[in-house]
Amino acid sequence: MAVTACQGLGFVVSLIGIAGIIAATCMDQWSTQDLYNNPVTAVFNYQGLWRSCVRESSGFTECRGYFTLLGLPAMLQAVRALMIVGIVLGAIGLLVSIFALKCIRIGSMEDSAKANMTLTSGIMFIVSGLCAIAGVSVFANMLVTNFWMSTANMYTGMGGMVQTVQTRYTFGAALFVGWVAGGLTLIGGVMMCIACRGLAPEETNYKAVSYHASGHSVAYKPGGFKASTGFGSNTKNKKIYDGGARTEDEVQSYPSKHDYV
């Protein structure tokens, strides 16, 4: 029951996370014009991964797509790639996890197959979450770098006579959506991996023993099937795995920590 709950919750959390990653990727507010300590302008600039927008105080908003591929900063391309990889992996993970759900019966799929699928989807969710977190963090790092660069020369001009407003950009809503979504996908993936351990049929750790019945030279070797009256709590005959109790050690890489103009 706990396994089903863990798996189900992991699936739901990952689903929300991936929806968030998709939303963040599509959002225009990855970077927004910094209003603090700046002249109050009648226009508000904000940028996304795919287009930049200007909202005028009149209420009109104009967005322009980045119609060039080669002319864009490498970092922006990298962030796009990370987010897309995250979405693709997450989507595949969701598809796999649907079939892996304990509450869904598909033909005569064995628990071992479900366990493997759960683990696969879990790993996919973890990588998807890490891709999103990495993508958002790379963009944020670019923003921070550019912010301080533009702060250093906030106003430029000939001898201070003519001032040019230097537009500085700060973190947009999409960054926070991306971080949270990436984190949720990661948590969901971990939950799926935990659920996988519970789904895997229990293994026996006892050694094979030969029983000599009188008049017969038959050796009974436990290992193929569990006796219904014998060891373990299961009353059904289940195929078990040879070898000791297996542990799943999840290899997890942590994220490393953009404004483009």
Epitope: P39, A42, V43, Q47, E56
Partner: antibody, heavy 117, light 113 residues
């Protein structure tokens, strides 16, 4: 068609308050922002402030302390309130509709305000 | 506040003549986000409210004759009337539409000889 019409008291005594109404037709205040501009007799234009579609406002810093702009979307009316009036507040007051580039594409005919005792 | 200066303060011209008037701002009106200059030109005839001619420094408002042309970027802007007509006699104002408060220039008065 788009129309803006200002209506005001005409004559106000010094230190008194003023309320001018801008009634619009042909468009909605939920879609367009409105700006207020005044012009003293024989002089140039002075921007007073504006009210955005969501109800947010921005005022001329020199007049901010005694200026207030509000609106009633359902009545298609924008209100300009100004207190502590002085003789140099005598001017023709215009309301205009904000358009692309924050420009004013439609203006009212204006209402003349005279501050005199 | 941004200071807008217009020159000349008045112009006396003959019909059919080409006229150029200048507007300068104390700060750049160029928005880096869309590379547009937030400067507007208005025409005001006696006893009438101002009329929008040009926005974004060079975009002509619909219905405005093509003899009116706006140009310039950053801090220096120009309004050109290619062939002045009698109906063009008015005061021309430029306005900063970028940084609050949205200040107007003092105006350039166009008169006929």
């Amino acid at each position: 068609q788009v129309q803006l019409k200002e209506s005001g008291p005409g004559l106000v005594a010094p230190s008194q308050s003023l309320s001018i109404t801008c009634t619009v037709s042909g468009f909605s205040l939920t879609s367009y922002a409105i700006s207020w501009v005044r012009q003293p007799p024989g002089k140039g234009l002075e921007w007073l402030g504006e009210i955005w579609t969501g109800g947010g406002t921005n005022y001329n810093s020199a007049l901010k302390s005694r200026l207030s702009i509000s609106k009633d979307n359902s009545k298609s009316q924008v209100f300009l309130k100004m207190n502590s009036l002085q003789t140099d507040d005598t001017a023709r007051y215009y309301c205009g509709r904000l358009s692309y580039g924050n420009s004013l594409d439609y203006w009212g005919q204006g209402t003349t305000l005279t501050v005199s005792s | 506040d941004i200071v807008m200066t217009q020159s000349p303060s008045s112009l006396t011209v003959t019909a059919g003549e080409k006229v150029t008037m200048s507007c300068k701002s104390s700060q750049s009106l160029l928005n880096s986000g869309n590379q547009k200059n937030y400067l507007t030109w208005y025409q005001q005839k006696p006893g009438q409210p101002p009329k929008l001619l040009i926005y974004w420094a060079s975009t002509r408002e619909s219905g405005v004759p093509d003899r009116f042309t706006g140009s310039g970027s950053g801090t220096d802007f120009t309004l050109t009337v290619s062939s002045v007509q009698a109906e063009d006699l008015a005061v021309y104002y430029c306005q900063n539409n970028f940084i609050y408060p949205l200040t107007f220039g003092p105006g350039t008065k166009l008169e006929l000889k």
